[in-house]
Interface confidence: low
């Protein structure tokens, strides 16, 4: 006989990512005896909450909380019962709620209070429901990506922790209502609001981050729709042969389309809008989203926002990944270079509705919007953030790393549960439980 080492006890953490279009629940796990090790926290399971994001329940706050129940019931099953009381539970809301908080702060408070009431009914260690700032969303996405890819520290074969020489990855997140760019930079930011100083594992990181509200995929599509109604009476980014009834109240209810809102419009009026498959007009429409006219700093990305030159490799996730994956997988188009990405966007925008449906059978939802989405991603990366061909070569489009979704949720939990220490780890020996 020989002694058999028991596998270590696991700890769990739950994050509800309350995005603008939907809510996702992520359950993370890690060995209790290795809490400060890097790359040790992984995704245990996930659950997509049915229905829209919690911000869509502004008129029905209790509906927001009720929508979460299915996933919370799943969490009761996924986390061992004896671990329930010690499992932290967080809800973080992003740009959808930031927008609601701007237009109707009472409604956003009511939604959060309703959600809080429901979350406290569960046996987990509920630690709050709150709206993340754009900076948080960007930085926690960056932390997640670099934690999962073990860019902070790594355990070497000689039994020592060391900082890998490859440096950190930049992170680009394209949500439904905002987009974030975050990367390590050597020089101080000219706009201090865009700089975050981090101390992780005894290393100091100076990080540039900026979140562009209203530049998430869904809000961009709404803004393009408003522009198309305003300037063309048809939609150059939609495929020819595609037509739909547009409810004006839906188009203009967002603060993101406020600037395009006609002075006197009937919110219950419906307008018929048709696509024209015009890549050049579509490109012009998308270009109108970016302003390069004034910059109060030595250099800017767009809209007068300071940004140092993009440096190093980047991981682009969420809708960046979905858009590029559609071009690559569904359309079979190469997207390895910026030129190819632009050509792919033009290709999609040239397709008629019939051609698009034949090429991508069974994917009706949002199919008409992929031209605008692809054109926007291409313009945001090249003109907006200033990626040239060389820099673009260092961008990987990824949904997961180490079987864990890349997004702000893991980084948020790591921070709030102090799973990334500021101090460097001592000389520790690893224990293999395999």
């Amino acid at each position: 006989t020989r002694d058999v080492r028991e596998p270590p006890a696991l700890k769990y953490g739950i994050v509800l990512d309350a995005g603008s279009s939907h809510t996702s629940m992520f359950i993370y796990k890690w060995p209790a005896d290795k809490e400060n090790d890097t790359g040790i926290v992984g995704q245990h399971s996930s659950c997509d909450v049915p229905g829209g994001g919690i911000s869509s329940y502004a008129d029905n706050p209790s509906g927001a909380s009720q929508s979460l129940v299915g996933c919370l019931e799943q969490a009761l099953q996924d986390v061992p019962k004896e671990r329930h009381a010690g499992t932290p539970l967080y809800l973080g809301a992003t740009a959808g709620m930031r927008l609601l908080n701007l237009t109707n702060p009472e409604a956003s408070t009511s939604v959060l209070m309703a959600v809080t009431h429901t979350l406290t009914q569960y046996p987990f260690d509920f630690r709050g429901a709150r709206i993340l700032s754009g900076q948080e969303e960007g930085v926690f996405g960056w932390v997640t990506a670099n934690y999962l890819l073990e860019n902070f520290i790594k355990y070497g074969w000689v039994g020592r922790w060391f900082r890998p020489r490859k440096g950190t990855l930049g992170a680009m997140d394209l949500g439904g209502a905002s987009t974030q760019i975050t990367f390590e930079t050597t020089s101080p930011a000219e706009d201090r609001a865009s700089e975050v100083q981090l101390h992780l594992y005894g290393q100091h990181y100076r990080v540039y981050t900026h979140s562009f509200l209203c530049y998430g995929r869904d809000q961009v599509l709404q803004r393009l729709l408003a522009s198309a109604l305003q300037t063309h009476g048809f939609h150059p980014c939609w495929p020819r042969g595609f037509s739909t009834q547009v409810l004006l109240g839906d188009v203009y209810q967002s603060p993101c389309t406020m600037a395009q809102r006609p002075q006197n419009f009937n919110s219950s009026a419906r307008v018929s809008l048709s696509g024209s498959s015009d890549p050049h007009l579509c490109r012009d429409l998308v270009s109108g989203l970016f302003s390069f006219s004034s910059c109060p700093f030595s250099r800017c990305s767009f809209n007068g926002v300071f940004q140092p030159p993009v440096a190093g490799n980047f991981v682009a996730f969420s809708a960046f990944f979905y858009t590029v994956d559609f071009l690559r997988t569904s359309m079979g188009l190469p997207v390895a270079t910026l030129q190819q990405l632009e050509a792919a966007a033009v290709n999609v925008c040239n397709q008629t509705w019939a051609q698009l449906q034949a090429r991508v059978p069974g994917q009706r939802a949002r199919l008409a919007d992929y031209c605008a989405g692809a054109m926007f991603v291409q313009q945001l990366l090249s003109r907006g953030y200033g990626f040239d061909e060389r820099a673009f070569g260092g961008v990987i489009f990824q949904k997961k790393a180490a079987d864990t979704a890349v997004g702000w949720a893991l980084g948020y939990m790591l921070n709030l549960t102090n799973l990334i220490p500021a101090d460097p780890p001592g000389l520790r020996k690893g224990t293999d439980f395999s």
Epitope: N101, L102, P105, T109, R127, G128, S133, Q135, E136, E137, G138, V139, F140, V143, R192, A193, E195, V196, Q197, L198, T209, G411, N415, L416
Partner: antibody, heavy 125, light 106 residues
Framework: QVQLVQSGAEVVKPGASVKISCKAS????????MDWVKQAPGQRLEWIGD????????TYNQQFKGKATITVDKSASTAYMELSSLRSEDTAVYYC??????????????????WGQGTLVTVSS | EIVLTQSPATLSASPGEEITLSCSAS?????IHWYQQKPGQAPRLLIY???NLASGIPARFSGSGSGTFYTLTISSVEPEDAAVYYC?????????FGGGTKLEIK
């Protein structure tokens, strides 16, 4: 330098209203939220509410909803707080405070970095 | 709402002495700020985000803590430190303050 100058002391009768002001200087008024805090004699400080001058959006502590109304005049870089239906328990020093923030680890940590000198409101018949 | 309880309510110290003021939260908070208020004056920011010294505050002041328990330490008390010290949480709405600790100098 950054300064918040509040209006002078007020003595008001029960049931009346009072509007106190807080003039900001030395910084861009619309870049920071302005909060109001109550300090009643022998009591702890209580947060009343705040206003975002850029968007004219105010948020209140539930306890002060209906009691306090916070507004701004952007052109005058001035925040106001009106207290209505005054009672003896509203007797207190009221402070305006600028909501500063410190960005660390991606989180905006808010705090009150500059305070007005305070306005004493006495409710007495 | 989160209730912050400060102890002791009053503290008497001699110049040069090291003292510690505590602030206990009714449930976990992410960070705490500390303010100093002298008689007839408005509160003044002392320490923000648990341990960061505000501009112009002497290095003898320091803060630490996490979760539900936070402390403010004055390493060598000076006569001008006589004041009421308040802790303040901004983790959970509505934002709340502690009841204060009054520091008297012997």
């Amino acid at each position: 330098q950054v300064q918040l100058v509040q209006s002078g002391a007020e003595v008001v009768k029960p049931g009346a209203s009072v509007k106190i002001s807080c003039k900001a200087s030395g910084y861009t008024f619309t870049d920071y939220n302005m909060d109001w805090v109550k300090q009643a004699p022998g009591q702890r400080l209580e947060w009343i509410g705040d206003i975002n001058p850029k968007y004219d959006i105010s948020t209140y502590n539930q306890q002060f909803k209906g009691k306090a109304t916070i507004t701004v005049d952007k052109s005058a870089s001035t925040a106001y707080m009106e207290l209505s239906s005054l009672r003896s328990e509203d007797t207190a020093v009221y402070y305006c405070a600028r909501r500063g923030f410190f960005l660390y680890y991606g989180i905006n940590y808010y705090y009150f970095d500059v305070w007005g000198q305070g306005t004493l409101v006495t409710v007495s018949s | 709402e989160i209730v912050l309880t400060q102890s002791p309510a009053t503290l008497s110290a001699s110049p040069g002495e090291e003292i510690t003021l505590s602030c206990s939260a009714s449930s976990s908070v992410s960070y705490i700020h500390w303010y100093q208020q002298k008689p007839g004056q408005a509160p003044r920011l002392l320490i923000y985000s648990t341990s960061n010294l505000a501009s112009g505050i002497p290095a003898r002041f320091s803060g630490s803590g996490s979760g539900t328990f936070y402390t403010l330490t004055i390493s060598s008390v000076e006569p001008e430190d006589a004041a009421v010290y308040y802790c303040h949480q901004w983790s959970s709405y509505p934002w709340t303050f502690g009841g204060g600790t009054k520091l008297e100098i012997k």
